[in-house]
């Protein structure tokens, strides 16, 4: 649950983030957990921990391994583990799977892709961008901040995007670079105001005490790729994030489906062992895009025991 | 907005036992510590022991060690703290309180009063 | 245990007064990491105490400016410039360095 994978290549700089968190957190400590030994905290060191984050200034492939970090406060410790592997540079250009942080998705209105982990690093703008091992020029390709703009997205765009960048320590740069898949939706298409297919409006759903229950938003948008198109539920007009009730989740990432060629999202929320003051809160499931937002609500009722009949 | 709702005002009688509720909301229970803090009639205050609700260790102050417990529900997000032995000294304002990331005591709840009497 | 000892016990003051209250702790609140842990809060009659200030000098979310602490490893003061008239109440410092936590015995601040 507290481990994260982290991955690099050799003679470049590796920052990683201990996976756990502390509330309060006073310091954090970082071990190699195979020896046991302390990570050292002194800059002069080529891998030294600070604070919640460990630093491989430059990395090597020896420096493969998993890292315990504890994180300390006064009350409680708490203990992560980052699963690091640092890989030889490839000769040729193709970049392989293991080294691939997550695939995005763009299209002509939107086509914003984020240089992955950058965050952690101290860089100065701009930063580099490749395509396929290019480096690419002309007006349609513009770095801002710490991602790529590609104006008038084509499906010839697809591909993998490198970014490349300083990270500077101490008056030491260290080169960084991360990839990542694009690729390119079909932009042919519309959009219109919400239709909420699921749940009907004011339906009342009927789910047993003690039981787990799902409830779908779904709602469709228009036609293909849609901007700005989102599905949520509500409790009591409050944010599921933000009501703070553990067993009540919603499913994380939306689920794009295209039913009769329109573009609808779905999302779940599910609750855990079915308590009665669930029976008392108002849930409302809401789709929204530019054109607006529509909102249908749900109740629970308990559902009667069937009646057996030999 | 984070809310820390105890339970309502005790009377007890000497050498029997309390528990007291505090339900969370507005933010993700099992992130952040609960910690329990006592109040006597007229007088400062005086930590008492946590838990962290992720896992359900706990520490307590010397002076309470062997008489308090504190648990937690992750389910309903709720942390209790229950106070045994009780002697007419225990009378007093309990409060929860909960940290954030920077800091213990970010968060308190009403107070609960319990009185011990015979 | 480390002791938090406040002074004085009580003080008059009027509106738009500074108003000082001093804090001394038993052993250096200064941890390894270079934070100072000392707190303090603002406790009306009936009410739970209120955060306001922490480690040492930052202000929580939504204190006014006229709050504003400072101090050493030790020796520590909360400064109100000018008291309000809702300013009124009772103000202990706190130490969440080492277990068990500890408060001072508390300063009541009364309308003179």
């Known amino acids: 649950k507290f481990s994260k994978q982290s991955w690099g290549l050799e003679n470049e700089a590796l920052i990683v983030r201990c996976p756990r968190q502390g509330k309060p957190s006073y310091t954090v400590d970082w071990y190699y957990s195979q020896t046991n030994k302390s990570i050292p905290t002194q800059e002069r060191n080529r891998v030294f921990a600070s604070g919640q984050l460990l630093k491989f200034l430059p990395a090597a492939v020896a420096d493969s391994g998993i890292y315990t970090c504890i994180v300390r406060s006064p009350t409680f410790n708490r203990t992560g583990y980052a699963n690091v592997t640092i890989y030889k540079k490839q000769s040729d250009c193709n970049v392989p799977d293991y080294l691939m942080y997550s695939t995005v998705s763009g299209s002509e209105k939107n086509s914003k892709i984020y240089c992955p982990t950058i965050d952690l690093y101290n860089w100065t703008a701009p930063l580099e961008w490749f395509k396929n091992c290019q480096a690419l020029q002309g007006s349609r390709y513009r770095a801002h901040k710490s991602f790529l703009v590609i104006d008038n997205v084509m499906t010839e765009d697809a591909g993998d995007y490198t970014c490349k960048f300083i990270h500077n320590e101490n008056g030491a740069n260290y080169s960084v670079t991360a990839t990542r898949s694009f690729t390119v939706k079909d932009e042919q298409g519309f959009s219109l105001f919400p239709v909420i297919g699921a749940p009907a409006q004011n339906e009342i759903k009927e789910v047993e005490i003690g039981k787990n229950a799902n409830l779908t938003c779904s709602a469709c948008f228009g036609k293909g790729t849609q901007f700005l198109a989102a599905v949520l539920w509500q409790l009591n007009g409050t944010k599921i994030t933000d009501f703070g009730e553990p067993r009540i989740q919603q499913e994380e990432g939306q689920n794009q489906s295209f039913s009769n060629g329109l573009a609808c999202l779905d999302m779940v929320l599910r609750i855990a062992d079915v308590k009665e003051e669930d029976l008392l809160l108002q849930y409302d499931c809401l789709a929204l895009n530019l054109h607006g937002l529509r909102r249908h609500t749900v109740r629970l009722s308990r559902k009667n025991p069937i009646d057996h009949h030999s | 907005e984070v809310q820390l709702v105890q339970s309502g005002a005790e009377v007890k009688k000497p050498g029997a036992t309390v528990k007291i509720s505090c339900k969370a909301s507005?933010?993700?229970?099992?992130?952040?510590?609960m910690h329990w803090v006592q109040q006597a009639p007229g007088k400062g205050l005086e930590w008492m022991g946590a838990?962290?609700?992720?896992?359900?260790?706990?520490v307590y102050a010397e002076k309470f060690q062997g008489r308090v417990t504190i648990t937690a529900d992750k389910s309903s997000s709720t942390a209790y703290m229950e106070l045994s032995s009780l002697r007419s000294e225990d009378t007093a304002v309990y409060y929860c309180?909960?940290?954030?990331?920077?800091?213990?005591?970010?968060?308190w709840g009403q107070g609960t009063l319990v009185t011990v009497s015979s | 245990d480390i002791q938090m000892t406040q002074s004085p016990s009580s003080l008059s003051a009027s509106v738009g007064d500074r108003v000082t209250i001093t804090c001394r702790s038993s052993?250096?609140?200064?941890?390894?990491?270079?934070?100072?842990?000392l707190y303090w809060y603002q406790q009306k009659p009936g009410k739970a105490p209120k955060l306001l200030i922490y480690?040492?000098?930052n202000l929580a979310s939504g204190v006014p400016s006229r709050f504003s602490s400072s101090g050493s490893g030790t020796d520590f003061t909360l400064t109100i410039s000018s008291l309000q008239p809702e300013d009124f109440a009772t103000y202990y410092c706190a130490q969440n360095l080492e277990l068990p936590f500890t408060f001072g015995q508390g300063t009541k601040v009364e309308i003179k």
């Open positions: 838990i962290d609700p992720e896992t359900g260790d706990t």
């Open positions: 052993k250096s609140l200064l941890h390894s990491n270079g934070i100072i842990y």
């Open positions: 480690q040492l000098s």
């Open positions: 507005g933010y993700i229970f099992i992130d952040s510590e």
């Open positions: 309180t909960g940290s954030t990331t920077d800091y213990y005591f970010a968060y």
